[in-house]
């Protein structure tokens, strides 16, 4: 039960963060007019990865595509690939995450396949979420330094009467939203990894421990398997479905002293 | 039609206060933003306050900060400028002006209502 | 705060004269973020109260008509009557619209000879 639920409760996290990159990523607000100690304007103006915006007193907002690749700066340039990557990987995993998930049933797909692809799907999570976060950490860092240089530099003009003013930005809603979300899909990508560790069958095959009881040869295997007469069936450790309800997360029952007949 | 009717206006004596109103009709009230402009006799246009649509935005500068107060009801599609601690140089036509969708543009304007500050 | 200096303080013209009138700022009113001067023009004729001409520099307000011509960037600022009729006999106001506290210019008197 613990695995169904660390693997379900890891896919809802990791879509909850994947939808909140992609969120990120579409943003205008990933930075904004700084306001504080700056000259009250009547425009508010932020910038996202694909359009800057100018809000005006009235409300009206008007946004201006980036209509160039080559005349934008390499790091915003980074920080889209970084985002867009992310926002790929997350996808796969999410996809690969549906059919690992223990609560649907494809076939007659294997415990180790789920469990392959449990673990495929948790690491996609794990990288997608560190795109995420490395994207917004530079974007970050660009603003920061650009911060610092617009403040050393604020009035810019010509020592005389007219002066210029430049905008400075600081850090918007999409930076935020982007830390969260990539800290989500990290997460559920940590949380898919772990469960991947319980849904794996173990990789040793345990001896069977025989009881010798009024002449019949009745081998054991512990962890729930059933037990197959004689040593020559079953040895491969494959689950025998009895059709009941029961999950592979239940308490599992070994031979006890009272086992045999 | 956009209309802008202010009302209020009179002799005050120095140091006294008044209470400028402005009636709008013609469009949704509660959407716009709006100023308050004088005129002072023969002089040019000067800015006296500013409020958003929701009253949560509110300038001034600095020749009225803390003497006027701007308000305004947006179900009576009123606006209001209390003015208090006046001085001879408050006199002038005051304006009731929406600010217009774009271009923070002053667009339309009433036709005004006179203020004299005199002993 | 932002300083307007209209220039000339007056001017006299005959009907159907071209006429230009200056604006300067203290400051620049463009906004890099979408390129546009955050500047306005308002004429304001005898006993009445100003009405809008010209937005963002350059943009005529509907109803206006097109012998009035607004141009320039930055802190230079110009609008232009192409061919004066005698109803444009007024007073013309350049506006700051991008900084609080908004200023207006001083004014320039359109006047016939």
């Known amino acids: 039960m613990a695995v169904t639920a660390c693997q379900g409760l890891g896919f809802v996290v990791s879509l909850i963060g994947i939808a909140g990159i992609i969120a990120a990523t579409c943003m205008d607000q990933w930075s904004t007019q700084d306001l504080y100690n700056n000259p009250v304007t009547a425009v508010f103006n932020y910038q996202g990865l694909w359009r800057s915006c100018v809000r005006e007193s009235s409300g009206f907002t008007e946004c201006r595509g980036y209509f160039t690749l080559l005349g934008l700066p390499a790091m915003l340039q980074a920080v889209r690939a970084l985002m867009i990557v992310g926002i790929v990987l997350g996808a796969i995993g999410l996809l690969v995450s549906i059919f690992a998930l223990k609560c649907i049933r494809i076939g007659s797909m294997e415990d180790s396949a789920k469990a392959n692809m449990t673990l495929t799907s948790g690491i996609m999570f794990i990288v997608s979420g560190l795109c995420a976060i490395a994207g917004v950490s530079v974007f970050a860092n660009m603003l920061v330094t650009n911060f610092w240089m617009s403040t050393a530099n604020m009035y810019t003009g010509m020592g005389g009467m007219v002066q210029t003013v430049q905008t400075r930005y600081t850090f918007g809603a999409a930076l935020f939203v982007g830390w969260v979300a990539g800290g989500l899909t990290l997460i559920g990508g940590v949380m898919m990894c772990i469960a991947c560790r319980g849904l794996a069958p173990e990789e040793t095959n345990y001896k069977a421990v025989s009881y010798h009881a009024s002449g019949h040869s009745v081998a054991y295997k512990p962890g729930g398997f059933k037990a197959s007469t004689g040593f020559g069936s079953n040895t491969k450790n494959k689950k025998i479905y009895d059709g009941g309800a029961r999950t592979e997360d239940e308490v599992q029952s070994y031979p006890s002293k009272h086992d045999y007949v | 039609d956009v209309q802008l009717v202010e009302s209020g206006g009179g002799l005050v004596q120095p140091g006294g206060s008044r209470k400028l109103s402005c009636a709008a009709s013609?469009?949704?009230?509660?959407?716009?933003?709006m100023h308050w402009v004088r005129q002072a006799p023969e002089k040019g246009l000067e800015w006296v306050a500013y409020i958003s649509s929701g009253s949560s935005t509110i300038y001034y500068p600095d020749t009225v900060k803390g003497r006027f107060t701007v308000s305004r009801d947006n179900p009576k599609n009123t606006l209001f400028l209390q003015m208090t601690s006046l001085r001879s140089e408050d006199t002038a036509m005051y304006y009731c002006?929406?600010?217009?969708?774009?271009?923070?543009?002053?667009?339309?304007w009433g036709q005004g209502t006179s203020v004299t500050v005199s002993s | 705060d932002i300083v307007m200096t209209q220039s000339p303080s007056s001017l006299t013209v005959t009907a159907g004269e071209k006429v230009t009138m200056s604006c300067k700022s203290s400051?620049?009113?463009?906004?890099?973020?979408?390129?546009?001067?955050?500047l306005t023009w308002y004429q304001q004729k005898p006993g009445q109260p100003p009405k809008l001409l010209i937005y963002?520099?350059?943009t005529r307000e509907s109803g206006v008509p097109d012998r009035f011509t607004g141009s320039g960037s930055g802190t230079d600022f110009t609008l232009t009557i192409s061919s004066v009729q005698a109803e444009d006999l007024a007073v013309y106001y350049c506006?700051?619209?991008?900084?609080?506290?908004?200023?207006f210019g001083t004014g320039t008197k359109l006047e016939l000879r």
């Open positions: 400051q620049s009113l463009l906004n890099s973020g979408n390129q546009r001067n955050y």
């Open positions: 013609g469009f949704t009230f509660s959407s716009f933003g």
């Open positions: 002006v929406r600010l217009g969708p774009r271009g923070n543009v002053m667009d339309h």
């Open positions: 963002w520099a350059s």
């Open positions: 506006q700051n619209v991008y900084f609080y506290p908004l200023t």
